[in-house]
């Protein structure tokens, strides 16, 4: 659900930690429409998701650890 | 301790529909997903779909869409499971069971089921 | 969807056996499986998470490996009390899909 690197909506299935290499941020006041974390996945696939979720907000703390461990 | 019970055996007519409560105790309701897994007579389990406390997210398997309603009470840490639109293939035990982010997204207590039958 | 296919579906086996039931996945999971034990009347348990992690209160007779698509439940020396149906899970992605389950009989 991205549109020149924006994501327009969120996708409405729940990714394992397992599954997903990183994420960035994208702001809805830096020229997209919504917030949204862009997970992206071991397969190279970029998925949008909501940031208000309680899983999404799970993972990106897992993997923030992760960054500040190395 | 941990513990999910869940109403009593329920029969009811093609066309009805069904409403099934899973009460938790013992930990902090809001803080783990609950999820719903049937079996049906004769057939493996399978999972029908998820709802977060914390936040009344709803995840579904895609076959119970429009079938399912999820719903939770959290002033009575109590999660529902509602059925509609009955037919015989509903006839299954359902279960309500906890996911646990921390179990590798397992499902580590489970309540004890209850039957639903739909017979005319 | 990702399919998970477990064989074999029945087992017969004597106390003492070692048994090893087998689960695959239709694409790579990456350790992202859990398995589950059921007897009949009661409702499933949690057995092993994370494809190799043995769940709270599960004795050490049981072990999970495998990694991609393929993945082992292994019981080293079966008891009595072992004799259920045995279920793997997919938890990469939703729907979180489950095999058809391998029953496991006395000989």
């Known amino acids: 659900a991205s549109n020149f690197d924006c994501c327009l909506g969120y996708t409405d299935r729940i990714l394992h930690p397992k599954f997903i290499v990183g994420f960035t941020r994208q702001l809805a006041n830096e020229g997209c429409d919504i917030n949204a974390i862009i997970f992206h996945t071991k397969k190279k696939l970029s998925v949008c998701a909501n940031p208000k979720q309680t899983w999404v907000k799970y993972i990106v703390r897992l993997l923030s650890k992760k960054v500040k461990n190395m | 301790q941990v513990q999910l019970v869940q109403s009593g055996a329920e029969v009811k007519k093609p066309g009805a529909s069904v409403k099934v409560s899973c009460k938790a105790s013992g930990y902090t309701f809001t803080s783990y997903w609950m999820h719903w897994v049937r079996q049906a007579p004769g057939q493996g389990l399978e999972w029908m779909g998820l709802?977060?406390?914390?936040?009344?997210?709803?995840n579904y398997n895609q076959k119970f869409k429009g079938k399912a309603t999820l719903t939770v009470d959290t002033s009575t840490s109590t999660a529902y499971m509602e059925l509609s639109s009955l037919r015989s293939e509903d006839t299954a035990v359902y279960y309500c069971t906890r996911g646990n982010y921390g179990v590798d997204y397992g499902m580590d207590y489970w309540g004890q089921g209850t039957l639903v039958t739909v017979s005319s | 969807d990702i399919q998970m296919t477990q064989s074999p579906s029945s087992l017969s086996a004597s106390v003492g056996d070692r048994v090893t039931i087998t689960c695959g996945a239709s694409e790579n999971i990456y350790g992202a499986l859990n398995w589950y034990q059921r007897k009949p009347g009661k409702a499933p348990k949690l057995l092993i998470y994370?494809?190799?992690n043995l769940a709270d209160g599960v004795p050490s007779r049981f072990s999970g490996s495998g990694s991609g698509r393929d993945y082992t439940l292994t019981i080293s020396s079966l008891q009595p009390e072992d004799f259920a149906t045995y279920y793997c899970?997919?938890?990469?992605?939703?729907?979180?899909?489950f095999g058809q389950g391998t029953k496991l009989e006395i000989k």
């Open positions: 709802i977060d406390p914390s936040d009344k997210y709803t």
């Open positions: 994370g494809a190799t």
């Open positions: 899970q997919n938890v990469l992605i939703t729907p979180y899909t």
